[in-house]
Interface confidence: low
């Protein structure tokens, strides 16, 4: 008997209170199916029901977490049903408070290098899951290290490629609640850098300004970058602007920093919309210094 294929949309990780669509596809074209849940709490809305094409399940509660299979109608089988489909594990998030996700040494990772993702919590989670946005396959399951202050896991990821870059979140769970997850950590953007040639960075009116004076940093390149990212050393996050084609054939973005009070080392990167987590080499660092201010960074 042909096994049908069960899938979950938008994915297998579902926030408590949200909905998930379970779709059972038969290669033979039969669109009626039954659903069963293999473990955990029973889900009465599945019992003795025939679904057509798909089933919108929700709003989900922790009781919906577990392993699902479907059987499609199969008139040529003795039972009238196909063999059970592949298993789909639905994980429900929001059951525990969120962990924190950090990148060491930082979220900008040179192509080919390794980054350590650290997920930690003051809750003693024995298991952590690492999930990349836009990926439908199951999250990566990691064993947590328990300690007095809570729990953590370190995951070494590399060598870095555009395929590994993206927006990551982690979740915590405890052994006996395998499919009930914490709320997601705040998102962490892991970016692979060094894929394209470096842009140029300059300052107007210049890299040395009076305290309170306006300064604009311009990032430009002959590469067809859609977006430029400006980062300041020792600061998380970056400014992001769309590139504009200039008369001289360069693609440029101007970052108005406004009235500056503190200096710092700035770098910029270029990237393409189609690959938002893959950036160029960094520009040469541009030290911006502020005079008439006792504090220089």
């Amino acid at each position: 008997q042909d096994k049908p294929f069960l899938s979950a949309w938008p994915g297998t990780v579902v926030s408590e209170g949200q909905h998930v669509t379970l779709q059972c596809r038969s290669r033979l074209g039969f669109n009626e199916f039954s659903l069963s849940k293999e473990d955990g709490m029973p889900v009465p809305e599945l019992y003795n029901r025939i679904f057509r094409n798909s089933f919108l399940m929700g709003p989900v509660t922790p009781a919906h977490a577990g392993t699902y299979r479907c059987c499609s109608s199969h008139p040529h089988s003795p039972t009238g049903w196909s063999a059970p489909s592949n298993p789909v594990v639905i994980m429900v998030t929001g059951v525990h408070r969120k962990p924190s996700l950090l990148a060491h040494p930082g979220p900008l990772v040179k192509s080919g290098e390794t980054v350590i993702l650290q997920c930690w919590s003051d809750v003693r989670f024995e298991r952590f899951l690492l999930h990349r946005e836009g990926i439908t396959e199951d999250p990566l399951r990691l064993v947590g290290q328990l300690h007095d202050a809570g729990s953590q896991v370190n995951y070494s990821m590399g060598p870095m490629t555009p395929a590994l870059a993206g927006t990551y979140r982690c979740f915590g769970s405890v052994t006996h609640l395998p499919y009930e997850l914490s709320a997601p950590s705040d998102p962490l953007d892991i970016v692979v850098v060094g894929l394209y040639g470096k842009p140029s960075l300059s300052a107007q009116p210049g890299p040395t300004v009076q305290a309170g004076e306006n300064v604009t940093l311009s990032c430009s390149s002959r590469s067809l970058f859609d977006i430029y990212h400006l980062s300041r050393e020792a600061e998380a996050g970056e400014l992001r602007l769309t590139a504009v084609l200039r008369v001289n054939g360069t693609f440029q973005a101007n970052f108005p920093l406004g009235p500056v009070t503190h200096g710092g080392n700035y770098r910029c990167f270029g990237s393409f919309r189609a690959l938002p987590h893959a950036w160029s080499d960094p520009s040469d660092p541009l030290p911006v210094s502020v005079t008439g201010n006792s504090r220089h960074l």
Epitope: G40, P62, A65, V123, V174, T175, H176, Y179, E180
Partner: antibody, heavy 121, light 98 residues
Framework: QAYLQQSGAELVRSGASVKMSCKAS????????MHWVKQTPGQGLEWIGY????????NYNQKFKGKATLTADTSSSTAYMQISSLTSEDSAVYFC??????????????WGQGTLVTVSA | SMYASLGERVTITCKAS??????LSWFQQKPGKSPKTLIY???RLVDGVPSRFSGSGSGQDYSLTISSLEYEDMGIYYC?????????FGGGTKLEIK
């Protein structure tokens, strides 16, 4: 139907160790956490910790770290708890209790009948 | 201890030190016996437990209600929170016939 059979009462000298057992039947031993709980008239019920026989992973209440050691023998579907350096404060009834596979929604789904430990001077 | 008459509605309460997200169980224990789980996840009745038992609550405050007390309901009732480690039991409430 899951069933947990605990070993018999123990009378032990102060300073010695005691190892009690909890034999599981009626379910897959390696798929469920086995918790241990202490009961005394003075302190009521206290959670000691648990072992996951599937991989031997343990999680202890800090209060019992170094005092209790949890182990499991998958070949005989038996969980063990050893209590060391016994004092009169360790005189209690000790229960093993199995969690639910999914969700520990049940808190502790099944309980053993308890093992009475009496520590003598 | 708590005293109640047969047929009476009885409510026992349990307060957690923080929000435990309904990870709370109720147990009944009779002298010389092991505890018996009645309610899990704050309000879900264990199979085989009479429907006169019910649980409610959220956040930090939870309660166990017996809608009509029967003689066999005498015993000590404990709550357990299992939202995170270490799991913690309440001190117990002894329910006796008035």
């Amino acid at each position: 139907q899951a069933y947990l059979q605990q070993s018999g009462a123990e009378l032990v000298r102060s300073g010695a160790s005691v190892k009690m057992s909890c034999k599981a039947s009626g379910y897959t031993f390696t798929s469920y956490n086995m918790h241990w709980v202490k009961q005394t008239p003075g302190q009521g019920l206290e959670w000691i910790g648990y072992i996951f026989p599937g991989d031997g992973g343990t999680n202890y209440n800090q209060k019992f770290k170094g005092k209790a050691t949890l182990t499991a023998d998958t070949s005989s579907s038996t969980a063990y708890m050893q209590i060391s350096s016994l004092t009169s404060e360790d005189s209690a009834v000790y229960f093993c209790a199995r969690s639910g596979y999914y969700g520990n929604y049940e808190g502790f789904a099944y309980w053993g009948q308890g093992t009475l430990v009496t520590v003598s001077a | 201890s708590m005293y109640a008459s047969l047929g009476e509605r009885v409510t026992i309460t349990c307060k957690a030190s923080q929000d435990i997200n309904s990870y709370l169980s109720w147990f009944q224990q009779k002298p010389g016996k092991s505890p018996k789980t009645l309610i899990y996840r704050a309000n879900r009745l264990v199979d085989g437990v009479p429907s006169r038992f019910s649980g409610s609550g959220s956040g930090q405050d939870y309660s166990l209600t017996i809608s009509s007390l029967e003689y066999e309901d005498m015993g000590i009732y404990y709550c357990l929170h299992y939202a995170e480690f270490p799991y913690t039991f309440g001190g117990g409430t002894k329910l006796e016939i008035k």
